[in-house]
Amino acid sequence: DTEIKVNPPQDFEIVDPGYLGYLYLQWQPPLSLDHFKECTVEYELKYRNIGSETWKTIITKNLHYKDGFDLNKGIEAKIHTLLPWQCTNGSEVQSSWAETTYWISPQGIPETKVQDMDCVYYNWQYLLCSWKPGIGVLLDTNYNLFYWYEGLDHALQCVDYIKADGQNIGCRFPYLEASDYKDFYICVNGSSENKPIRSSYFTFQLQNIVKPLPPVYLTFTRESSCEIKLKWSIPLGPIPARCFDYEIEIREDDTTLVTATVENETYTLKTTNETRQLCFVVRSKVNIYCSDDGIWSEWSDKQCWEGEDLSKKTLLR
């Protein structure tokens, strides 16, 4: 009874198409597959950034796979051939592993890479990234930002840099068509007459770094003798109402401070007849239904009622 064996895939490699972290893993079928012509061979692929605790595992019939990686670190991957039990009249047969690694050969001491990179997608419309120059780099150092997301043919360079003392310290991006809910890759590299500059790679999704505009049109309405309804409107822009969470700060007679988080554009406040002054501000953030994370907007302008009967008048700012 001869033991059934199968070879690992051939020519296993990680290919960098220049998309700043989105890599292709590809391979060829194993040698001597003739005995298994009636069989659909599968491949088990495992890959990770070096230093990561866990492997991602994929089982596929294809000869390629694509995914995003952190190019600040190396990448390791391994693959083996799987013969399903239907092909072997028994248990599944696995080949030995074929392994490969990939990393960007660095240049420059780590301190030279940009510091404190910060990207904000203002009102889900305008992306702005800013950074500080690396430690100890001279004023002749210039940083360049490149970006890519699925839908672009190739990585693009920033065309509108924010400058300080002649150095690029940020980028205002153009309109980014169909760029949310997918990985957005950035590389900031640099050049200097004085010393080599270390590149930095960043990946995020735009919907997770949105900073909305603050809410507008804050109003009061007396609902009953002891209830006041606070209302506001969503700001102009592409963010739908269903995507907002709000935080309210209410100050009553300069003493009581109420803070609350709500999902709608209204909040009902219990008051006493003694209330002489009421002020509130609101800010907004994209909620968990539309993103995994977000940035609070600035606070709205303050809306106050003072010394008037709220049942007689609705205040509109």
Partner: antibody, heavy 116, light 108 residues
């Protein structure tokens, strides 16, 4: 097996010059940066310079005016040209492979003695 | 320059002892760029621990590293005869790259 072998050390007079070599084998030389690190007799380690895989260079600024690092990828070799040598340059000079921002393999070292 | 100060500069210990060596940086160093090397007399240094706490290939598990910011530690949980050597911490964060002065571990 990764190997780094230094050569070119010896006795040289103050003010003289010397060129050290580091022959690399067992890995894809073009993908790695390589450092020179020195150690004076009975003392600690002092970083001299690195030649990155892309060809650029970083030096210990205290030494860069007298020392020049270079590499020949066709020969899998790294070099350190040392000019205007002083007694305090007497040391064992090591080359070391850079991998993931650490020096993971070192040569056995070559002794440079600067004395009249 | 970042000064790396090791203490003690030397210590005497017996086989089986727990040994702790500390390294203090004059400026904060990212834990990614703090490494430890072992050097035996007449030999080249050997990478022992990289990125503060990761054992280099082939290094026994009795070695461990920890720390952050400016304070880092190398620990040998149970000293073995082959561990008698000089140990150096090293920062790879800022130029010039610098090493600690070394800690010589000798047989008591």
């Amino acid at each position: 097996e990764v190997q780094l072998v230094e050569s070119g050390g010896g006795l040289v007079q103050p003010g003289g010059s010397l060129r050290l070599s580091c022959a690399a084998s067992g890995f894809t030389f073009t993908k790695y940066g390589v450092h020179w690190v020195r150690q004076a007799p009975g003392k600690g380690l002092e970083w001299v310079a690195v030649k990155w895989a892309g060809g650029s260079t970083d030096y210990n600024s205290a030494l860069m005016s007298r020392f020049t690092i270079s590499r020949d990828n066709a020969k899998n070799s790294l070099y350190l040209q040392m000019n205007s040598l002083r007694a305090e340059d007497t040391a064992v000079y090591y080359c070391a492979r850079d991998h993931r921002d650490a020096m993971d393999y070192w040569g056995q070292g070559t002794l440079v003695t600067v004395s009249s | 320059d970042i000064q790396m100060t090791q203490s003690p500069s030397s210590l005497s210990a017996s086989v089986g002892d727990r040994v702790t060596i500390t390294c203090t940086a004059s400026l904060s160093v990212s834990s990614t760029y703090l490494h430890w090397y072992q050097q035996k007399p007449g030999k080249a240094p050997k990478l022992l621990i990289y990125s503060t706490s990761n054992l280099a290939s082939g290094v026994p598990s009795r070695f461990s590293g920890s720390g952050s910011g400016t304070d880092f530690t190398l620990t040998i949980s149970s000293l073995q005869p082959e561990d008698f050597a000089t140990y150096y911490c090293h920062q790879y964060h800022r130029s010039p790259l610098t090493f600690g002065g070394g800690t010589k571990v000798e047989i008591k």
